[in-house]
């Protein structure tokens, strides 16, 4: 029950997180014009990953897409890539996790398969969340650098006669959405990985192992052993045979990866 709840909650949290990552990626307010001490401005600039916008005090808003790939800063391209990778991994993770949900029955899918899928989706969510957090953080760092650079030369002009106010940009709403969404996806992924441990079957029956002893052939079927649930030293699960024994399909008989999530 607790496993199902953990898995379900992990799925929902990840779903919200990925929806947030998608929203942040599409949002125009990655960077917004710094208003200094003036909350009301006649022309307000803000920029996203895909286009920049200008909102006038008259109420008109005009947005222009970045219709170039080569002319864009490498950092912006990197942020785009990170966000897209995050979305793709998250989407695949969601697809996998739907089939992995304990509450959903699909044919005669074994718990071990569901555990595998849960772990896979969990890892995907973790990487997706990290990609989003990294993307947003890179953009934020870029903004901070540019902010102080433009503050240093806030006013430029000839002999101070004519002033050109340089537009400074600060953190937009999309950054906070991205950070929160990335965090949620990460948490959801961790929850999925935790749930995976509980989904691993209590009794793991292994296929017949053939022992090729000298002189005669003996087929030995072990009764199986309890799957370890601890992270400590595994004293009970000793190697059955040290010699040239192999399972028929090369499945190793020592503890499965689910024991070490």
């Amino acid at each position: 029950m607790a496993v199902t709840a953990c898995q379900g909650l992990g799925f929902v949290v990840s779903l919200i997180g990925i929806a947030g990552i998608i929203a942040a990626t599409c949002m125009d307010q990655w960077s917004t014009q710094d208003l200094y001490n003036n909350p009301v401005t006649a022309v307000f600039n803000y920029q996203g990953l895909w286009r920049s916008c200008v909102r006038e005090s008259s109420g008109f808003t005009e947005c222009r897409g970045y219709f170039t790939l080569l002319g864009l800063p490498a950092m912006l391209q990197a942020v785009r890539a990170l966000m897209i990778v995050g979305i793709v991994l998250g989407a695949i993770g969601l697809l996998v996790s739907i089939f992995a949900l304990k509450c959903i029955r699909i044919g005669s899918m074994e718990d071990s398969a569901k555990a595998n899928m849960t772990l896979t989706s969990g890892i995907m969510f973790i990487v997706s969340g990290l990609c989003a957090i990294a993307g947003v953080s890179v953009f934020a760092n870029m903004l901070v650098t540019n902010f102080w650079m433009s503050t240093a030369n806030m006013y430029t002009g000839m002999g101070g006669m004519v002033q050109t106010v340089q537009t400074r940009y600060t953190f937009g709403a999309a950054l906070f959405v991205g950070w929160v969404a990335g965090g949620l996806t990460l948490i959801g992924g961790v929850m999925m990985c935790i749930a995976c441990r509980g989904l691993a079957p209590e009794e793991t029956n292994y296929k017949a192992v053939s022992y090729h002893a000298s002189g005669h052939s003996v087929a030995y079927k072990p009764g199986g052993f309890k799957a370890s649930t601890g992270f400590g030293s595994n004293t009970k699960n000793k190697k059955i045979y040290d010699g040239g024994a192999r399972t028929e399909d090369e499945v190793q008989s020592y503890p499965s990866k689910h024991d070490y999530v």
Epitope: V40, T41, V43, V54, S57, F60, R64, Q163, T164, Q166
Partner: antibody
Framework: EVQLVESGGGLVQPGGSLRLSCAVS?????MNWVRQAPGKGLEWVAW????????TYADDFKGRFTISRDDSKNTLYLQMNSLRAEDTAVYYC???????????WGQGTLVTVSS | DIQMTQSPSSLSASVGDRVTITCKSS????????????LTWYQQKPGKAPKLLIY???TLESGVPSRFSGSGSGTDYTLTISSLQPEDFATYYC?????????FGQGTKVEIK
């Protein structure tokens, strides 16, 4: 078609108060008051976002003038207090448009401050 | 606040003449976000409300004759009437539409020679 009709102008004594109205018909996101003293140029007074009621003023009018709007009546107001002789002017309401230009103007209402 | 300086303050011209009015701002009116200059031109006739001619320094308002044109960027702007018509004799104002407070130039009166 947008129509702006001002009212409320007239003769007032120095130190007195007056409230100008501008009846607005048609879509307006933001509105302005602009004044013109006799024989002088145009002077911007104040701006308001008609949806949020957020205002901003020219420095000379902060504290003395208040721009506001009444959603139900679709009316713009300019409350003028502590009036001085130099406030004598024709007051226009104007709608903000693309490029922050003022595309529609009222006919103007004359305010005379005199003892 | 941005100061707007128009020149000349008045000029005399004949019908058919090419007229140029200049406007200088104390700060750049060019917005980096959309690369547009927030400079507006108005025409005002005696006893009438002003009329919007040009916004974004060079975009003609709908219904305004094509003989009117605007140009300039940064701090220097120009209003040109290619061929002056009798109805064009009026006072012309430039306006900073880039930042509050919006400020107007002192005006240029175009009179009949």
């Amino acid at each position: 078609e947008v129509q702006l009709v001002e009212s409320g102008g007239g003769l007032v004594q120095p130190g007195g108060s007056l409230r100008l109205s501008c009846a607005v018909s048609g879509y307006t996101f933001s509105m302005n008051w602009v004044r013109q003293a006799p024989g002088k140029g145009l002077e911007w007074v104040a701006w308001i976002n008609m949806y949020t009621g957020e205002p901003t003023y020219a420095d000379d009018f902060k504290g003395r003038f208040t721009i506001s709007r009444d959603d139900s009546k679709n009316t713009l107001y300019l409350q003028m207090n502590s009036l001085r002789a130099e406030d004598t002017a024709v007051y226009y309401c104007a709608r903000s448009s693309r490029g922050n230009g003022f595309d529609y103007w009222g006919q103007g209402t004359l305010v005379t401050v005199s003892s | 606040d941005i100061q707007m300086t128009q020149s000349p303050s008045s000029l005399s011209a004949s019908v058919g003449d090419r007229v140029t009015i200049t406007c200088k701002s104390s700060q750049s009116l060019l917005n980096s976000g959309n690369q547009k200059s927030y400079l507006t031109w108005y025409q005002q006739k005696p006893g009438k409300a002003p009329k919007l001619l040009i916004y974004w320094a060079s975009t003609l308002e709908s219904g305004v004759p094509s003989r009117f044109s605007g140009s300039g960027s940064g701090t220097d702007y120009t209003l040109t009437i290619s061929s002056l018509q009798p109805e064009d004799f009026a006072t012309y104002y430039c306006q900073n539409a880039y930042s509050f407070p919006f400020t107007f130039g002192q005006g240029t009166k175009v009179e009949i020679k």
